[in-house]
């Protein structure tokens, strides 16, 4: 650091004073010199280092009428908000000719009430779940001892005797407030008060109770909620998308979920208006007066297939001699699953019913036995999925074929000699 030489008398007639105060204090250091001729620029040192960006001003006035007379120079260094980094030894420095002069030192010290570097933050925690809170304070003067308070009640007999920087809370069953006091020789500072809100624990064991094509019954086990009873639980269901890849803990799915509320108890809910034979993901959260729990992970579920809700449409049956031509269209009503085929039944007035599995074709030619004199022959068709048969169509009487009527070429299906199985219907 530059040092004043003793060859000439120091020009400084006033040296920086001392400042000791609390953080945030605004203070001013000044030095004064008297020089002959053009006044020099006054620099400020802190702990021997020139302050390049000092908030300083310099005021100078000539004592005489001649510029070569003496000048009074006052340099002022302003400290706007005292911080720990401002503390140290301060001096003024001037270069006069080939010499360097340094004033006597002044000292800036920080001393006051403790200052918080970290304070407890508001947060939410699940009931009976451990968590930590942080508090950190410093002087000077040191040492700084902390005292934690819960709901304004000290958690130790004296400052410094209990937990210090980190408070471990094994769990809460009610919403509580926490603060910490910082004590030093100058007094006490109290931190902000953090509110720790106790929410219900995440529900567990979300599972399916029963499945139907358009509804799922689900149940779960509620988590602890402290002294606050659960008011309701909310269940969300979303259509699964193969490309979406919902996994445990992943972000919310892109579709708008179907949301249902359940009064509790019981911790069970019937989700209706679902699509049959469709994969869904479901999750549940439960709410008390303090707020909602976290959601469970998404659980993949699937509605089962159902039977078709309606019979095949536009059934026509025409007869030409010993052959009968029957065709139909797919049911307009929801299939509730994957269509596996059609069943056809026909019966004469005095003959047993014949039941056939046609597969996925929508037309068939029946080869009637005998001379074709079976009277009042009627045909019924039903669609089926893996879940079973849908409703049968109303019996359609066989009409005689009239010349000129279009007749598609059908694969002949020989009527079996004995019925494949008999079906009690209509």
């Amino acid at each position: 650091a530059p040092r004043g030489t003793q060859a000439e008398e120091s020009p400084f007639v006033g040296n920086p004073g001392n400042i000791t105060g609390a953080r945030g204090l605004t203070g001013t250091l000044r030095c004064q010199l008297q020089v002959q001729g053009e006044p020099p620029e006054v620099h400020w040192l802190r702990d021997g280092q020139i302050l390049e960006l000092a908030d300083s001003t310099q005021t100078q006035v000539p004592l005489g009428e001649d510029e070569q007379d003496d000048w009074i120079v006052v340099s002022q260094l302003r400290i706007t908000s005292l911080q720990l980094s401002d503390t140290g030894q301060y001096q003024c420095l001037v270069f006069l000719g080939h010499q360097t002069f340094v004033s006597q030192p002044g000292y800036v010290g920080l001393e006051g009430l403790p200052y918080f570097l970290e304070e407890p933050e508001d947060r939410t925690v699940a009931a009976n779940t451990p968590f930590n809170l942080s508090c950190q304070a410093q002087g000077p003067p040191e040492p700084v001892d902390l005292l934690w308070l819960q709901d304004a009640v000290p958690l130790a007999t004296a400052p410094g005797h209990g937990p210090q920087r980190s408070l471990h809370v094994p769990g809460l069953n009610k919403t509580s407030s926490f603060s910490c006091e910082a004590h030093n020789a100058k007094g006490v500072t109290t931190s902000r008060t953090a509110t720790i809100t106790v929410l219900p624990q995440q529900p567990r064991n979300l599972h399916l109770v029963s499945r139907q094509p358009t509804e799922l019954e689900v149940a779960w086990t509620p988590g602890l909620s402290g002294i606050y009873p659960l008011t309701h639980c909310t269940l969300q269901a979303v259509l699964s998308d193969d490309g979406m890849g919902i996994q445990a803990g992943e972000p919310d799915p892109p579709e708008e979920p179907l949301t249902s509320q359940a009064s509790v108890p019981p911790h069970q809910l019937r989700l209706g208006s679902l699509h049959p034979h469709t994969p869904y993901h479901i999750r549940v959260a439960c709410t008390s007066s303090q707020g909602p729990s976290s959601w469970t992970h998404w659980l993949p579920v699937e509605t089962p297939e159902g039977v078709p809700l309606g019979p095949p449409e536009n059934i026509s049956a025409t007869r030409n001699g010993s052959q009968a031509f029957v065709h139909w269209q797919e049911p307009r009503a929801p299939l509730q699953g994957t269509l596996l085929g059609y069943r056809l039944a026909y019966q004469g007035q005095d003959t047993p019913e014949v039941l056939m599995d046609i597969g996925l074709r929508q037309e068939v030619t029946l080869e009637l036995q005998g001379d074709g004199s079976v009277s009042n022959l009627t045909v019924c068709v039903a669609a089926y999925t893996a879940a079973g048969d849908g409703p049968w169509s109303l019996p359609v009487p066989l009409e005689a074929w009239r010349p000129g009527q279009a007749q598609p070429v059908h694969q002949l299906v020989k009527e079996p000699s004995t019925p494949a199985f008999s079906w009690p219907w209509w």
Partner: nanobody, 115 residues
Framework: QVKLEESGGGLVQAGGSLRLSCTAS????????MGWYRQAPGKQRELVAA???????NYRDSVKGRFTISRDNAKNTVYLQMDSLKPEDTARYHC?????????WGQGTQVTVSS
């Protein structure tokens, strides 16, 4: 804009005393240097006395030991106590305030010392 107003001047016999006051319209604690200047007819203006924020006073050689400058920051006032006045002290006395590159001047008060 800071206004400086001088008072206390007058006619006094040689060897007598006067106390000049300079009151500022704003706080004077921020002014690094406060001074009293004088200007006699047909002469250059000259610094009589100055006082800094460190309460260090400077005087013109011709007034040393006779004049005393002081400042009262609480009253925003600077004083010049003039004792053992001489006829050559006759002049218009002006108050001045300096801070960095700013300076303010008063209109002055007349001091006449008769022999």
């Amino acid at each position: 804009q800071v206004k400086l107003e001088e008072s206390g001047g007058g006619l006094v016999q040689a060897g007598g005393s006067l106390r000049l006051s300079c009151t500022a319209s704003a706080s004077i604690s921020s002014f690094d240097i406060m001074g009293w200047y004088r200007q006699a007819p047909g002469k250059q203006r000259e610094l009589v006395a100055a006082i800094t924020t460190l309460d260090i006073a400077n005087y013109r050689d011709s007034v040393k030991g006779r004049f005393t400058i002081s400042r009262d920051n609480a009253k925003n006032t600077v004083y010049l106590q003039m004792d053992s006045l001489k006829p050559e002290d006759t002049a218009r006395y002006h108050c001045a305030a300096f801070q960095s590159d700013q300076n303010y001047w008063g209109q002055g008060t007349q001091v006449t010392v008769s022999s």
